[in-house]
Interface confidence: medium
């Protein structure tokens, strides 16, 4: 009984349940391979509970191990388009602070038009995650085809 | 010490750990693109702890943010079989109540025989999730090739 | 307040937050299709909190439902290489104890060079997970291309 009451009185944030699910806003200007993300109930089913967006990139607010997941679908794409424009590659990594820069997850499209993956990784408060799409094909902005998210798992 | 005891006395359901992992039962009749799922220890490694099945479709019992994941493998499939010009597509969405109908996750097979993805999404008590497979290729019912599940992540 | 203090005093392990993320160490000798994994902060971003490695295979230390995820990328691979060497298949399963041996997750590469998937499955203390890669192509050891992990979700 006591436990249940205490749990209700504590803000969720103190339990470390940081989570975010983002939808694609736009791609970067020339020479900038980054995807720019957006999130919030007004936009549909995207949200940020803990992490924040910094100029379209996701910034972590709580140290811990996170499940990072992503799906990106190329727009106006067929298996022949995808192979003709190969290599189209997506990489998710920590892009700042520079001292912690590292690629966390990388996939190539080859003859497919969608990539989807997920992984567990330690992230620290202040880490900014960037998603780089290299190649000439553009991503779909449909919210059920392209999305990016993180979920805090444990300290 | 007190916390540990209290935690043991509380039913898991009160912690919001709703989770389900389903295996394919069958595909739908004519003009019904839905996959019909089944779950339970007697069937193997599938289970439902919280969510329920309603005529083969997964119904949510607790509001919250969920991780939804799916893998579907086409049976009797090779890269040439997986149609080039008419991709077979899988979509996961809320199909009822009608007022909340939306596509959550969508993938095409292109020249592959398996799709797998996952995403975070808010779901509400009573939401029913449908998985629509469009095309003429049939899915494998092998439990390690085709499965669908949800995991409650936070309120 | 009391809850927060009690929670801080309890070791994380008692909350059941077992988690591991591994990177590829090496492939097996001839006739052994298993991938051999490694993990630990000294190696980069891989880690084991609860589960252990037994000769490169992941052994579970806590009963419960786990999210198992994997990504494997083939080295020196293009869509033509992948299709020429088809079938290249990855299977994740319980390989010991023998009485619980079962395939949990299976994917073929077809014309792609990366597979990635995830699923929820019940695992028991002492279960050892093996990842079998069949075919002639070798996996990439890049830590952002090939990884394998588990996350305890609930009892």
């Amino acid at each position: 009984q006591r436990f249940a009451q205490a749990q209700q009185q504590l803000p969720l944030e103190s339990l470390g349940w940081d989570v975010a699910e983002l939808q694609l806003n736009h791609t970067g200007p020339q020479q900038d391979p980054r995807l720019y993300w957006q999130g919030g109930p007004a936009l549909g089913r995207s949200f940020l509970h803990g992490p924040e967006l910094d100029k379209g990139q996701l910034r972590i607010h709580r140290d811990g191990i996170y499940m990072v997941h992503i799906q990106v679908t190329l727009a106006i794409c067929s298996s022949t388009t995808a192979s003709r424009h190969h290599p189209t590659t997506l990489a998710v990594g920590i892009c700042s602070p520079a001292s912690r820069s590292i690629s966390l997850l990388r996939l190539s499209f080859h003859q497919g038009c969608t990539i989807a993956s997920q992984r567990l990784t330690p992230l620290a408060r202040g880490d900014t995650l960037c998603t780089n799409l290299t190649g000439t094909l553009l991503p779909s902005r449909n919210t059920d085809e392209t999305f990016f998210g993180v979920q805090w798992v444990r300290p | 010490q007190r916390f540990a005891q209290a935690q043991q006395q509380l039913p898991l359901e009160s912690l919001g750990w709703d989770v389900a992992e389903l295996q394919l039962n069958h595909t739908g009749p004519q003009q019904d693109p839905r996959l019909y799922w089944q779950g339970g220890p007697a069937l193997g490694r599938s289970f439902l702890h919280g969510p329920e099945l309603d005529k083969g479709q997964l119904r949510i019992h607790r509001d919250g943010i969920y991780m939804v994941h799916i893998q579907v493998t086409l049976a009797i499939c090779s890269s040439t079989t997986a149609s080039r010009h008419h991709p077979t597509t899988l979509a996961v969405g809320i199909c009822s109540p009608a007022s909340r109908s939306i596509s959550l996750l969508r993938l095409s097979f292109h020249q592959g025989c398996t799709i797998a993805s996952q995403r975070l999404t808010p779901l509400a008590r009573g939401d029913t999730l449908c998985t629509n497979l469009t095309g003429t290729l049939l899915p494998s019912r092998n439990t390690d090739e085709t499965f669908f599940g949800v995991q409650w992540v936070r309120p | 307040q009391r809850f927060a203090q009690a929670q801080q005093q309890l070791p994380l392990e008692s909350l059941g937050w077992d988690v591991a993320e591994l990177q590829l160490n090496h492939t097996g000798p001839q006739q052994d299709p298993r991938l051999y994994w490694q993990g630990g902060p000294a190696l980069g971003r891989s880690f084991l909190h609860g589960p252990e490695l037994d000769k490169g295979q992941l052994r579970i230390h806590r009963d419960g439902i786990y999210m198992v995820h994997i990504q494997v990328t083939l080295a020196i691979c293009s869509s033509t290489t992948a299709s020429r060497h088809h079938p290249t298949t990855l299977a994740v399963g319980i390989c010991s104890p023998a009485s619980r041996s079962i395939s949990l997750l299976r994917l073929s590469f077809h014309q792609g060079c990366t597979i990635a998937s995830q699923r929820l499955t019940p695992l028991a203390r002492g279960d050892t997970l093996c990842t079998n890669l069949t075919g002639t192509l070798l996996p990439s050891r890049n830590t952002d291309e090939t990884f394998f992990g588990v996350q305890w979700v609930r009892p």
């Epitope: - | 069958h26 004519q30 003009q31 086409l74 009797i76 079989t81 008419h86 469009t134 | -």
Partner: antibody
Framework: QVQLQESGPGLVKPSETLSLTCTVS??????????WSWIRQPPGKGLEWIGY???????NYNPSLKSRVTISVDTSKNQFSLKLSSVTAADTAVYYC??????????WGQGTLVTVSS | SYVLTQLTSVSVAPGQTARITCGGN??????VHWYQQKPGQAPVLVVY???DRPSGIPERFSGSNSGNTATLTISRVEAGDEADFYC????????????FGGGTKLTVL
């Protein structure tokens, strides 16, 4: 090599039920992914799809025949069967069983002629 | 339900190219399969998914599909090619999953 063989009476009286069996060798009727199908061809005419069964029980039928058709499977004998009730002379045809994968019917039986006549 | 329209007959001299068409509303959005049926025999799948050939089918058989017409092309026609040819579509979203065309009789002159 997969082979299909139709069997059953070649003559059926009007208003009775036509019953045919297809025996499969070189493959299993319980394998995922296959549409085990019946197709017919009236003398001198084109092909008409009757229906199919898959996943050891799920069936789909041609709407024009649906009220009279039943397709079933017997996995123990590796067979699937067709029953067509209330037959008339218009049901006289060569009846084929076939295996499809959603990209065409790649294996066919040799066909059996069923005549509806009193 | 969906209707596939084929010409009743097509004639071609040996060594020439035969083109057999199959018409249907927006057929280009569907997968089309072609069968060859010789007298007294069961049909044989010669082209599937618009343009793919099963193993054992000569390269002389090819297919295309766009708009409202799918076409089976047989180059360097031989006497042994004489047969009935049927197109077929398979669409689980319609009330009739499997639809065959009426068939085209190919005569080799």
């Amino acid at each position: 090599q997969v082979q299909l063989q139709e069997s059953g009476p070649g003559l059926v009286k009007p208003s009775e039920t036509l019953s045919l069996t297809c025996t499969v060798s070189g493959g299993s009727v319980s394998t995922d992914g296959y549409y085990w199908s019946w197709i017919r061809q009236p003398p001198g005419k084109g092909l008409e799809w009757i229906g199919y069964i898959y996943y050891s029980g799920s069936t789909n039928y041609n709407p024009s025949l649906k009220s009279r058709v039943t397709i079933s499977v017997d996995t123990s004998k590796n067979q699937f069967s067709l029953k067509l009730s209330s037959v008339t002379a218009a049901d006289t045809a060569v009846y084929y069983c076939a295996r499809g994968i959603g990209l065409g019917f790649e294996y066919w039986g040799q066909g059996t002629l069923v005549t509806v006549s009193s | 339900s969906y209707v596939l329209t084929q010409l009743t007959s097509v004639s071609v001299a040996p060594g020439q190219t035969a083109r057999i068409t199959c018409g249907g509303n927006n057929i280009g959005s569907k997968s089309v399969h072609w069968y060859q049926q010789k007298p007294g025999q069961a049909p044989v799948l010669v082209v599937y998914d618009d343009s793919d050939r099963p193993s054992g089918i000569p390269e002389r058989f090819s297919g295309s599909n766009s708009g409202n017409t799918a076409t089976l092309t047989i180059s360097r026609v031989e006497a042994g090619d004489e047969a009935d040819f049927y197109c077929q579509v398979w669409d689980r979203s319609s009330d009739q999953d499997v639809v065959f065309g009426g068939g085209t009789k190919l005569t080799v002159l």
